[in-house]
């Protein structure tokens, strides 16, 4: 799939920070999403998980950004990249994990999908 360029990753990180900064209230009314393995292919997996959250304006930009990182079209209920579906977590926790890992990848220059 397409490799997210450094600038695109920076923009994703910045948006994830925007969503979470100083945030204590549950995101998306406390909606739960499938946890994902933070490995290669995580952007598609993240999108497949988050796309099932509807009516949450806070994460719409993140959903659009992730769709640009994923080589195939993703629709709600699709789980081709979501290898493990055994744990659901709050959207806020999911975003925080995604942010932490994306920053880790960025720091190490591994901007793979």
């Amino acid at each position: 799939g397409p490799v997210p360029p450094s600038t695109a990753l920076r923009e994703l990180i910045e948006e994830l920070v925007n969503i979470t900064q100083n945030q204590k209230a549950p995101l998306c009314n406390g909606s739960m999403v499938w946890s994902i393995n933070l490995t290669a292919g995580m952007y598609c997996a993240a999108l497949e998980s988050l796309i099932n959250v509807s009516g949450c304006s806070a994460i719409e930009k993140t959903q659009r950004m992730l769709s640009g990182f994923c080589p195939h079209k993703v629709s709600a209920g699709q789980f081709s990249s979501l290898h493990v579906r055994d744990t659901k977590i709050e959207v806020a926790h999911f975003i925080t994990k995604l942010l932490s890992y994306t920053k880790q990848l960025f720091r190490h220059g591994q901007q793979f999908n």
């Epitope: 990180i13 910045e14 925007n18 979470t20 100083n22 204590k24």
Partner: antibody
Framework: EVQLVESGGGLVKPGGSLRLSCAAS????????MSWVRQAPGKGLEWVGR??????????NYAAPVKGRFTISRDDSKNTLYLQMNSLKTEDTAVYYC?????????????????WGQGTTVTVSS | SYELTQPPSVSVSPGQTARITCSGD??????AYWYQQKSGQAPVLVIY???KRPSGIPERFSGSSSGTMATLTISGAQVEDEADYYC???????????FGGGTKLTVLG
């Protein structure tokens, strides 16, 4: 030792400019979100603005009274934060503090850690 | 612009419990932070993220939050706690910081 040391304050005429510096040591400055806070004589604390770490986008935000006149920047290679103040007004007279930004502590490596400089005095008077 | 409102002053006798409040419309979703400032000194963080206490801060300092109000509680206030206390938070975007007007705590010795 974890510390911040401000410099560059002084007396300046209305309409003039001044650049404040804040030298950081003892922590990973590049990971830190940094703020400028000021305190006018006998008044309360006023948030001036903040700059995120570069990895978090390097976004800079300003308080309404200084937007368009003040510019915050950072040089991670020198562990230094700057505040460029232009078009100064008498109401900008204050002690200026640099500090780690607690909102950014969650993203940096200084969770719950609190670092402030000793402050540098800026006096705007004709 | 967004504002945080604090009472200008609070007075207690030594050993009593002091409560300082901070109200703001965004506080249900944004964390509050509390700073202590003694005369001529830089502020010191005493509570972060509503309820957490930094290392080195005495256990008598605690924080809570409910709805649009955050509260700093000093259980068994001591003379050395006499200072100005400021709440700090952000607007709903999280992008702009704001301090409350400050509360002067007097511990009547």
């Amino acid at each position: 030792e974890v510390q911040l040391v401000e410099s560059g304050g002084g007396l300046v005429k209305p309409g003039g400019s001044l650049r404040l510096s804040c030298a950081a040591s003892g922590f990973t400055f590049s990971n830190a979100w940094m703020s400028w806070v000021r305190q006018a004589p006998g008044k309360g604390l006023e948030w001036v603005g903040r700059i995120r770490s570069k990895i978090d986008g390097g976004t800079i935000n300003y308080a309404a009274p200084v937007k368009g006149r003040f510019t915050i920047s950072r040089d991670d290679s020198k562990n230094t934060l700057y505040l460029q103040m232009n078009s100064l007004k008498t109401e900008d007279t204050a002690v200026y503090y640099c500090a780690t930004d607690q909102v950014g502590a969650y993203y940096g490596d200084y969770y719950g850690m609190d670092v402030w400089g000793q402050g540098t005095t800026v006096t705007v008077s004709s | 612009s967004y504002e945080l409102t604090q009472p200008p002053s609070v007075s207690v006798s030594p050993g009593q419990t002091a409560r300082i409040t901070c109200s703001g419309d965004a506080l249900p979703e944004k964390y509050a932070y509390w700073y202590q400032q003694k005369s001529g000194q830089a502020p010191v963080l005493v509570i972060y993220e509503d309820t957490k206490r930094p290392s080195g801060i005495p256990e008598r300092f605690s924080g809570s939050s409910s709805g649009t109000m955050a509260t700093l509680t000093i259980s068994g206030a001591q003379v050395e706690d006499e200072a100005d206390y400021y709440c700090y938070s952000t607007d709903s975007s999280g992008n702009h910081g704001v301090f409350g007007g400050g509360t002067k705590l007097t511990v009547l010795g």
